[in-house]
């Protein structure tokens, strides 16, 4: 029996219905210069087709506007069609601080990002802003930091704190939800020369996050009243053979090495999971690996512990795992895990298995292990080849949201938001987008609209409206912000 029956019910009124985008590359100049150029031109339409300036004539200009950025106009159009309440996007650290420190701040980039946020607010869409969104091909670090050993260098964490402080200062009056780092637990794909490189980089990423959180807590929270966390890649794991002890122990180990590795120090103890530390140490003792988790000082444990305001998880699929003893001193071999592809299951073109109940199990696991904290699913989605009628995405959204609703209604999980991944796809990349790379809408948009407007899967006669006071409050806040910062 693969699933429990569908439930009817609704998410709470303050639930965030979001869509996620990866890094937004800032446009360096507004793409509509005609409004800021005071000269008059005559277009030689039949001759050389050039514009000729008319001398001696000066026109009135208007101030530059956020919607002069073509890119922003496009995003706003897509977001308006999505009917979401929240938009998650990432800043480009390398664009904002090309030198990696505050000696050269790209104000134009910051203005662009401020425009994205403020224009979204005018549509009633709040931003969840990610400060650092590394991708496997490109670390997204400013050049000087990259050349100075990147995340293997502890000073990168201090540079990140300075960058975070700048962003909080420049955007924090408008942004109430911050993600410091997206999927730091996946950077092992890059820092994988040895396990010790992986664990060292992870350690510096944890410190970077904690420094940024502490800075916000001390300096910005009193006036801005926002919340800060980091997004962990959080796929679920199931034993390939549920009757084999070694398989479920491998699945347990996967969760420890993949999620608890970052969650335990931040959400709970200030230190790495005991199970992970012991497993690596035992392999070390048997001569199967030379890896070792960093030893944390008391000061480091104090720095890390409790530096999250909510739990943010990126969940896409469930992996089937079994135990396989692997020799070698890399993170992947330290875990002794082999992944199995179950070809009987519905899967996407990139072989992501559609296993909706995995998300419910994940949410239950987080609640049991880390307590009753607010949880946001900050990215969740599937790639679908279809350019118009993306039925796999509709099926995925419906089934995964059903399981999230079960976690909320039955398991008492404090789920606060779901951010579908992603807004628009990129050319020649797996098709995760609600819009094609040339901004054509797919039919899953209507499906997501319907779920959002119903606040889930309500009974026939139940109202999807929330109390008027709450709606008014949200509008008042929006108007106030918009008037304050156009």
């Amino acid at each position: 029996k693969e699933s429990t029956p569908d439930v009817q019910g609704q998410f709470p009124c303050d639930f965030s219905w979001g869509v996620t985008e990866s890094v937004l590359k800032p446009e360096s100049v507004a793409s509509s210069p005609q409004f800021s150029d005071p000269h008059l031109y005559v277009w030689n339409a039949t001759g050389n087709r050039l514009l000729h300036r008319v001398e001696g004539v000066r026109l009135k200009t208007r101030p530059a506007q956020c919607t002069d950025f073509v890119n922003i106009k496009k995003q706003l159009e897509m977001l308006a069609r999505m009917k979401v309440t929240h938009y998650r996007f990432a800043l480009d650290w390398a664009s904002v601080l090309p030198t990696g420190n505050l000696s050269a701040v790209n104000r134009q980039a910051l203005r662009y990002y401020r425009c994205v946020v403020s224009e979204g607010l005018k549509l009633g869409i709040s931003a969840m802003v990610t400060l650092y969104y590394p991708t496997h091909a490109h670390l997204g670090l400013p050049e000087p930091l990259l050349h100075a050993d990147g995340w293997l260098n502890p000073s990168t964490a201090e540079a990140f704190q300075a960058y975070a402080g700048l962003c909080f200062q420049e955007l924090g009056d408008l942004v109430k939800l911050w993600i410091t780092i997206n999927e730091p637990n996946r950077l092992s794909d890059i820092y994988n020369r040895s396990g010790n490189d992986t664990y060292g980089a992870a350690h510096n990423l944890l410190v970077a996050h904690a420094l940024a959180w502490r800075l916000y807590d001390r300096q910005f929270r009193p006036s801005q009243r926002g919340a800060v966390s980091l997004s962990l890649h959080a796929d679920w794991a199931e034993p390939a053979n549920p009757y084999a002890d070694s398989h479920w122990r491998a699945a347990e180990r996967f969760l420890q090495f993949e999620i608890a590795w970052f969650a335990e120090p931040l959400f709970k103890t200030g230190d790495y999971p005991a199970a992970m530390r012991e497993y690596i140490a035992s392999k070390h003792r048997r001569g199967l690996s030379s890896s070792a988790l960093p030893r944390l000082t008391e000061a480091e444990r104090r720095l890390l512990k409790g530096t999250v305001d909510f739990c943010a998880l990126n969940h896409f699929t469930t992996r089937f795992v079994m135990h396989e003893q692997l020799a070698g001193s890399r993170y992947d071999s330290d875990r002794d895990i082999q992944f199995l592809q179950d070809i009987t299951r519905l899967s996407s073109p990139t072989r992501l298995a559609v296993i909706p109940w995995g998300v419910r199990k994940l949410l239950r696991w987080v609640r049991r292990n880390y307590g009753d904290m607010d949880i946001y699913i900050t990215a969740s989605g599937i790639d679908d080849q279809a350019l118009e009628d993306d039925r796999l995405r509709k099926y995925y959204l419906g089934k995964y949201l059903q399981e999230v609703l079960k976690a909320y209604l039955i398991d008492k999980v404090r789920i606060k938001g779901y951010y579908a991944f992603k807004l628009a796809e990129e050319k020649s990349k797996p098709r995760f987008g609600f819009f094609t790379s040339d901004f054509k809408a797919k039919s899953s948009i209507q499906f997501y609209n319907k779920v959002i407007s119903s606040r889930g899967f309500p009974f026939e006669n139940s109202s999807s409206r929330c109390s008027q006071t709450q709606e008014n409050t949200e509008c008042t806040v929006c108007l106030f912000l918009v008037q304050k910062k156009p």
Partner: antibody, heavy 120, light 111 residues
Framework: EVQLVESGGGLVQPGGSLRLSCAAS????????VHWVRQAPGKGLEWLGV???????DYNAAFISRLTISKDNSKNTVYLQMNSLRAEDTAVYYC??????????????WGQGTLVTVSS | DIVLTQSPDSLAVSLGERATINCRAS??????????MTWYQQKPGQPPKLLIY???NLQSGVPDRFSGSGSGTDFTLTISSLQAEDVAVYYC?????????FGQGTKVEIK
């Protein structure tokens, strides 16, 4: 050796309250959940609730209005508070350790139990 | 709540013979690919002891004459060759749904 030791049992007046303690040794409450189960004299087992390693609790709905489970990680001790006691609450109260794996919902170690008698 | 009904209520078996205890649930205790059924043994004056988890997995230290099987709503605990020290009350327990519930118990004696 994993051990759970209950204390605080005894005679309680009807309408009164009880507060039981469960001292855990050789494992950490930040890693394992702890359940409370009771057994009326000569009867079967009845699950009351659990406090998970992260501090969240799940209760048997039949007791939710008068039951509170809490813990002190620094003392490695779990507590059960139960109010408005009646004669039918007379039982041996066990605290027991959760298996500690998300893939195994079971109880692997039990305390010896403490007897609570509700009588005037 | 899920009700678990054990049968028989009591069972007398000769030493070395097979003992079989059944446990029927009022609704399925299997979901998401897992069978949430556990078996415990309780001897007089002692707390229960874990025997079988996930319907069929033997807890370490438990003799392999104990085995569990079943799925959905019907589960079985088998003692392949009863020993004197196996005299006890045996309970099934489900954890598929809160509240966790136990069967009423089956008393195993020597014939």
């Amino acid at each position: 050796e994993v051990q759970l030791v209950e204390s605080g049992g005894g005679l309680v007046q009807p309408g009164g309250s009880l507060r039981l303690s469960c001292a855990a040794s050789d494992f950490s409450l930040t890693t394992y959940g702890v359940h409370w189960v009771r057994q009326a004299p000569g009867k079967g087992l009845e699950w009351l609730g659990v406090i998970w390693s992260g501090g969240s609790t799940d209760y048997n709905a039949a007791f939710i209005s008068r039951l509170t489970i809490s813990k002190d990680n620094s003392k490695n001790t779990v507590y059960l508070q139960m109010n408005s006691l009646r004669a039918e609450d007379t039982a041996v109260y066990y605290c027991a350790r959760d298996y500690g794996s998300t893939y195994v919902d079971a109880i692997d170690y039990w305390g010896q139990g403490t007897l609570v008698t509700v009588s005037s | 709540d899920i009700v678990l009904t054990q049968s028989p209520d009591s069972l007398a078996v000769s030493l070395g013979e097979r003992a079989t205890i059944n446990c029927r649930a009022s609704e399925s205790v299997e979901s998401y690919g897992n069978r949430y059924m556990t078996w415990y043994q309780q001897k007089p004056g002692q707390p229960p002891k874990l025997l079988i988890y996930r319907a069929a997995n033997l807890q370490s230290g438990v003799p392999d004459r104990f085995s569990g099987s079943g799925s959905g709503t019907d589960f079985t605990l088998t003692i392949s060759s009863l020993q004197a020290e196996d005299v006890a009350v045996y309970y099934c327990q489900q954890s598929n749904e809160d509240p966790w519930t136990f069967g009423q118990g089956t008393k195993v004696e020597i014939k």
